[in-house]
């Protein structure tokens, strides 16, 4: 039975040209995290495998930095980066847990962070 929950940074906003940290955290389970995949709609951003290290997709290589931890730093933001991002936790023996983050990239300097929320 899957008992874990994923806590994410929730709905967040950031300024065009700036950077943002995408972060998820898996709690309430003793399952071992073997890998975390980061995806945006229909494409892969990155994979962090506990043993094999990081994979950064070539389309994001210049703008994505691994970490902190299992998170991902997205740099040089453009308005095209607005949208949904998913962290997919591969765990043993539970299986996969998915968290969702919505990022809005703003032209102005009034970007504010949204509240944290949980996805069971």
């Amino acid at each position: 039975m899957m008992t874990g929950t994923i806590e994410t940074t929730g709905n967040i906003s950031a300024e065009k040209g700036g950077s943002i940290i995408l972060q998820c955290h898996l709690s309430s389970t003793t399952a071992q995290v073997t890998q975390v995949n980061w995806e945006q709609q229909d494409q892969l951003l990155a994979i962090c495998n506990a043993d094999l290290g990081w994979h950064i997709s070539p389309s994001f290589k210049d703008r994505v930095a691994p970490g902190p931890g299992l998170g991902l730093t997205l740099q040089s933001l453009t308005v095209n980066d607005t949208g949904e991002y998913f962290c997919i936790y591969h765990t043993y023996p539970d299986g996969t847990y998915t968290g969702r983050i919505f990022l809005e990239v703003l032209e102005s300097s009034v970007a504010e962070h949204g509240a944290r929320f949980q996805i069971p």
């Epitope: 995949n37 892969l44 994979i47 994979h55």
Partner: antibody
Amino acid sequence: QVQLVQSGAEVVKPGASVKISCKTSGYTFTENTMHWVKQAPGQRLEWIGGINPNQGGNRNNQKFKGRATLTVDTSASTAYMELSSLRSEDSAVYYCARSGLRDYAMDYWGQGTLVTVSS
Amino acid sequence: DIQMTQSPSSLSTSVGDRVTITCKASQHVSTAVVWYQQKPGKAPKLLIYSPSYRYTGVPSRFSGSGSGTDFTFTISSVQPEDFATYYCQQHYSTPWTFGQGTKLEIK
């Protein structure tokens, strides 16, 4: 230039073990993960596992768990795979292959080592 | 484990023809797909990754596309040196898995 040179062909008896080496040159050994891939006659390629020479962490295909041991000697820039409790279906060509820096695509491969399990 | 199924398993074609190979994953693999070429007695060679980027030195006649579960590999105009076996592979989750291969033969 990047090179991966594997040890020579082996003929081994069922139940025995074999240890294959993969000597690398032309790049910083600790920066790239090393993988091992099996190709039995007429079969698809099969990923055995990978090892990160920098931290020693390795991930194995459960199918080979307990029988395939991946190790590295960083001072010699060499990766090893030991396969134990050999059976006839282990007869195959085994390749080492390196994946890129922060990239999982296997961009350089060794020439392959033929292992024949026969009594 | 994620199963990768290629079609067709073999293909007879002529020099200059356009060839398309498909690869279907048993579950979502996003864009974590790679294509290799292998000639008899030789190690596989990386051609396409992620899944539309040509590896260094790979001719422009080779291309790839797809996302999710369905992927395509195309040779726009087959050359004599292209007769070989082609494999797709996913690295979305371990164990990494390969398709069964597509053998490109001379008609």
